[in-house]
Amino acid sequence: IVLRPSRVHNSEENTMRALTLKDILNGTFSYKTFFPNWISGQEYLHQSADNNIVLYNIETGQSYTILSNRTMKSVNASNYGLSPDRQFVYLESDYSKLWRYSYTATYYIYDLSNGEFVRGNELPRPIQYLCWSPVGSKLAYVYQNNIYLKQRPGDPPFQITFNGRENKIFNGIPDWVYEEEMLATKYALWWSPNGKFLAYAEFNDTDIPVIAYSYYGDEQYPRTINIPYPKAGAKNPVVRIFIIDTTYPAYVGPQEVPVPAMIASSDYYFSWLTWVTDERVCLQWLKRVQNVSVLSICDFREDWQTWDCPKTQEHIEESRTGWAGGFFVSTPVFSYDAISYYKIFSDKDGYKHIHYIKDTVENAIQITSGKWEAINIFRVTQDSLFYSSNEFEEYPGRRNIYRISIGSYPPSKKCVTCHLRKERCQYYTASFSDYAKYYALVCYGPGIPISTLHDGRTDQEIKILEENKELENALKNIQLPKEEIKKLEVDEITLWYKMILPPQFDRSKKYPLLIQVYGGPCSQSVRSVFAVNWISYLASKEGMVIALVDGRGTAFQGDKLLYAVYRKLGVYEVEDQITAVRKFIEMGFIDEKRIAIWGWSYGGYVSSLALASGTGLFKCGIAVAPVSSWEYYASVYTERFMGLPTKDDNLEHYKNSTVMARAEYFRNVDYLLIHGTADDNVHFQNSAQIAKALVNAQVDFQAMWYSDQNHGLSGLSTNHLYTHMTHFLKQCFSLSD
C-alpha cells in the first residue's frame, strides 16, 4: 500500500484545502524532471530557467554558458542541438505540430567559433526533420519529403532523394501509420556511428486509401485534410531501406538493403534499424501477420560497395501464442564484439526477459528470469548491463534499475534503485552518458518526482538535479487523496488495481465509484507514479473513489495475461473491469447505485462496451474519442492483435466486437460520448457511427464534439472537456455543484 500523507491532524485541518478543478486545469501541481543532454562521458547540456544553454562538466564541477538566451531569443528558438564537434548549434523555431511525434520547424545554424549565424546556403523552411552526424558537423535534413545532406553547415546541400511527394512518397520521415504504430518517431533516417553512412527509409503510400475530414478553421469554406491511412485489411505502405555513403554521395548513390526472403514473400513491415559499427547495420522486419519478426545483420562489402545480409545472420523471433514482442518488437543492444547482442523476448515460461544472442536465437543465453519482466535495456558496457524491471517486491507497476556485471562469471545482479528512496521512489527511468560513466535517475513516484545524478562505476549519488521543492511546498496545505495499489485474485487471474480514496476516507461509509479504464493491449494503468490530476480532484474535493484496474491484455505480467486478448479484443478487457467492480462492491464502501466508468481512446471503447454489457452495474459513463469498430482503426495496430477482417481470418470477431452492435444495451445507462472532429488517429467516424446506431435504436444519450481538435483535445478544449465531464459525473452521482 502506498499512502500519501494526508496530514489530517486537527490542528492543521483548518489550513488544509481540497484540490479544485481549477488547480488541475492550471497545472498548479505539475512536476519537473531533469534529463541531461549528454555530450560526452562527463559533460551535459541543460537549458536553464532563464533560457541559457549551459554546459556542465561533472568532473571539474564547472559550468559555462555556450549559448545565451539573447541568441536564442533573436530567432525565437524553442530548441537547440549542438554539433558533435562543438562548432555549431542549430536553433529550432516556428514549431508547428503535425501528428503525435512529427512537426515542422525553421532552423538556424549558429557558429560558436565566431559568435555569428551561418550566412549563405541557409536552410529552407519549413524543415520536417534535421539532425547532426554523430561525429563532426555534417547535417542531414528532410524538406518536402526529400533528404538533403550538407558536409558543413555553410555548404550547399546535396539532394539524396528526388521522388518525395506530399502524401505519396516519404523519404527519411515516416508516413502516418509508421509514425504512430511502428517507429514511434518523427524520423526515419539513421547515421552510422561515425557518420560515414546514412540509412533511410522510403515509404510509398501511393495505393493507400485516404481518410478525409473537414477542418473548419474560420474561412468561408472548410478545408479537407487528407491522410493516407491504412485501416484494418487495407493496402499498406510499401517500405524500402537505402544506405548512402555520405563522404562521396554523388558517386555510388543510395544502396537498397535487401529484405529477407522469408519476409519479402508476403506483405511486411520494417520495424527498426540499429547501427552496430560504420560497416555493420541491423534491420528488423515483421510480417504483416505480426507473429514473425526477422532481425537481419548486414555488412558493407568494400570491394563491391554494397550491403550484404547473409542468411546466417538472420534471426527469427516467432510467437505461437500471440503477436511478436510486447507493444513493439524489442530492439537489440549490441555488445562490444559488434556481432552478439542482448534482446528482450519471451522465455519458455512466457515472461519477457533479457537474452544474449551470440550465434542463433535457439542458442540464446537467458540473462534474467523469474515471474516478472525485464522492461528496457538502457546500456551495455564492457563490464555491465543496465536494465529496468518490475521484479522488486513483486509489484508489476514498479520500475527499478538493475546492473548486471557481464564482465565476471557468473554474472552478478545488483538493484541500483530499490533502496534509494524506497517510499518516495518506486518507478524509475535512467539516462546514461557515454560509456555509462555517469547516469541520471528520474524517479516518477509514488512520491514527488526527483532527478539525481550518479557515478556510473560506484552508483554513488553525486547531486540532486531536480527535487520539485516548490511543488512540495505548494502541496503542504492540500488534502491529497490516499492511494493504494493492491491485487485481486479471480479465477487464476491476478487483477492489480489502484484505488484513489478521498482524504477522510472512512471504510464504514458509502462512496460513489468511478472506474478509469484504458485497457489496451500491452498497456499498464496501475503504476507507482505521482500524479495530481482530474481524478485526484474528484477524490479530494468531490469525495469519489476512483479505481484503475489492469486486466487481461495488459503488460509486464507475463504472456498468459498479455496474449489472452489475442484475436478477441473487447471481450476480456471488459469482463475484467466488471469483475473488479463486483469485488469493489464486496469491499463494502461502494455505493452500488452510483458507479461510473470512463476512458479515452481504447479506454473509450472499453468503457462503452462495459456500459453496454447489460450487467446493470454502471449508472453512467463517458467515452472520449473511442474506437467503435476495429475496421475503422489503423492496420498496423489493429491487425497485430486481431488478424485480418476477412472471412477466412477474423471478420466475425471484427463484426461482433463493435460498440454499434450493442446500441440497444445503452438504454438503461447515461452515456456521454465525446470526440474531436479533427482526430487523425481515432477518426470522428467512430463516434459518428455510435451516434447513428444509438439514434437508430432510439436510445437517448449525451454528446459533445470539439471542432478542429485532434485525439488529444488540447488547449481550451481540455478545460471545457474536464469541466463538462465533471458536471456530467456530479449529476450522475447526485453531487451538488
Epitope: G120, D155, Q159, T247, Y248, A250, Y251, V252, G253
Partner: antibody
Framework: EVQLLESGGGLVQPGGSLRLSCAAS????????MSWVRQAPGKGLEWVSA????????YYADSVKGRFTISRDNSKNTLYLQMNSLRAEDTAVYYC??????????WGQGTLVTVSS | EIVLTQSPGTLSLSPGERATLSCRAS???????LAWYQQKPGQAPRLLIN???RRATGIPDRFSGSGSGTDFTLTISRLEPEDFAVYYC?????????FGQGTKVEIK
C-alpha cells in the same frame, strides 16, 4: 579489367524508338549505380539518366523525361536505355558510365544514335 | 540547374608548361561534388579528378584539382604530349548533373 560495351545505336526517324544496351564486365555490376551520358556531334557532354544498383530508383534529365526509360538486368550485367518519341536533338553518341551523379570512373566507347528523316 | 562555365575556351601551351584550367559554377558546389574529365578525339571521356579533389586510379600526380564554393581549378604541372585534349568539369551536387562546355588544351 572493367569493360562497358554499348550497342543498339543507329539511324532512326523522328518519333521512332531505339533501345540501347550496355554490357558490363570486370566489376560487380549489381553493386553500382549506372548512368547514360550523351555527346552531340562537336558538342559537350550531357548527362541523360541514372539508375541505382538495385534498379529501384531512376533519374532523368528534363530533356528526356517521359520519353526515355532507364533499366537494368543485374542477372545479365546489362544496362538499358529505351528511347521513344525520338527527336533530331537526341542525335548524339550515347555513353554508358559507371556512377550515379558524378565521378564517372569508367565509360563505354559509345554508340551513335542518329535521328533524321 | 547549375551552369558550369569553363575558361579559357582554348589554351595554347607547349609541352613542359603548366596548364591552369578554370571552372566556375553558377551556384556553390564544393569540391566534394566536382570532378574533372579528359577527352581525346574519337574516345570516351576519362575521369581525372574524382569528387573530393582525389586523383582517379592511374592518373599521374601532375594532375591536381583545387577550389571550393564556385571557383575550381584543374592544374597540370608539366604538360606531356599525351595531355593535349579537351577537359570537362562536372558537378554532381544537384540534379541534373551538369558538365562545363570544355576547355581545349592544344599544342602551341
Amino acid at each position: 579489367e572493367v569493360q562497358l560495351l554499348e550497342s543498339g545505336g543507329g539511324l532512326v526517324q523522328p518519333g521512332g524508338s531505339l533501345r540501347l544496351s550496355c554490357a558490363a564486365s570486370g566489376f560487380t555490376f549489381s553493386s553500382y549505380a549506372m548512368s547514360w551520358v550523351r555527346q552531340a556531334p562537336g558538342k559537350g557532354l550531357e548527362w541523360v539518366s541514372a539508375i541505382i544498383s538495385s534498379g529501384g530508383l531512376t533519374y532523368y534529365a528534363d530533356s528526356v523525361k517521359g520519353r526515355f526509360t532507364i533499366s537494368r538486368d543485374n542477372s545479365k550485367n546489362t544496362l538499358y536505355l529505351q528511347m521513344n518519341s525520338l527527336r533530331a536533338e537526341d542525335t548524339a553518341v550515347y555513353y554508358c558510365a559507371k556512377g550515379w551523379f558524378g565521378g564517372f570512373n569508367y565509360w563505354g566507347q559509345g554508340t551513335l544514335v542518329t535521328v533524321s528523316s | 540547374e547549375i551552369v558550369l562555365t569553363q575558361s579559357p575556351g582554348t589554351l595554347s601551351l607547349s609541352p613542359g608548361e603548366r596548364a591552369t584550367l578554370s571552372c566556375r559554377a553558377s551556384q556553390s558546389v564544393t569540391s566534394s561534388y566536382l570532378a574533372w574529365y579528359q577527352q581525346k578525339p574519337g574516345q570516351a571521356p576519362r575521369l581525372l579528378i574524382n569528387v573530393g579533389s582525389r586523383r582517379a586510379t592511374g592518373i599521374p600526380d601532375r594532375f591536381s584539382g583545387s577550389g571550393s564554393g564556385t571557383d575550381f581549378t584543374l592544374t597540370i604541372s608539366r604538360l606531356e604530349p599525351e595531355d593535349f585534349a579537351v577537359y570537362y568539369c562536372q558537378q554532381g551536387i544537384m540534379l541534373p548533373p551538369t558538365f562545363g562546355q570544355g576547355t581545349k588544351v592544344e599544342i602551341k
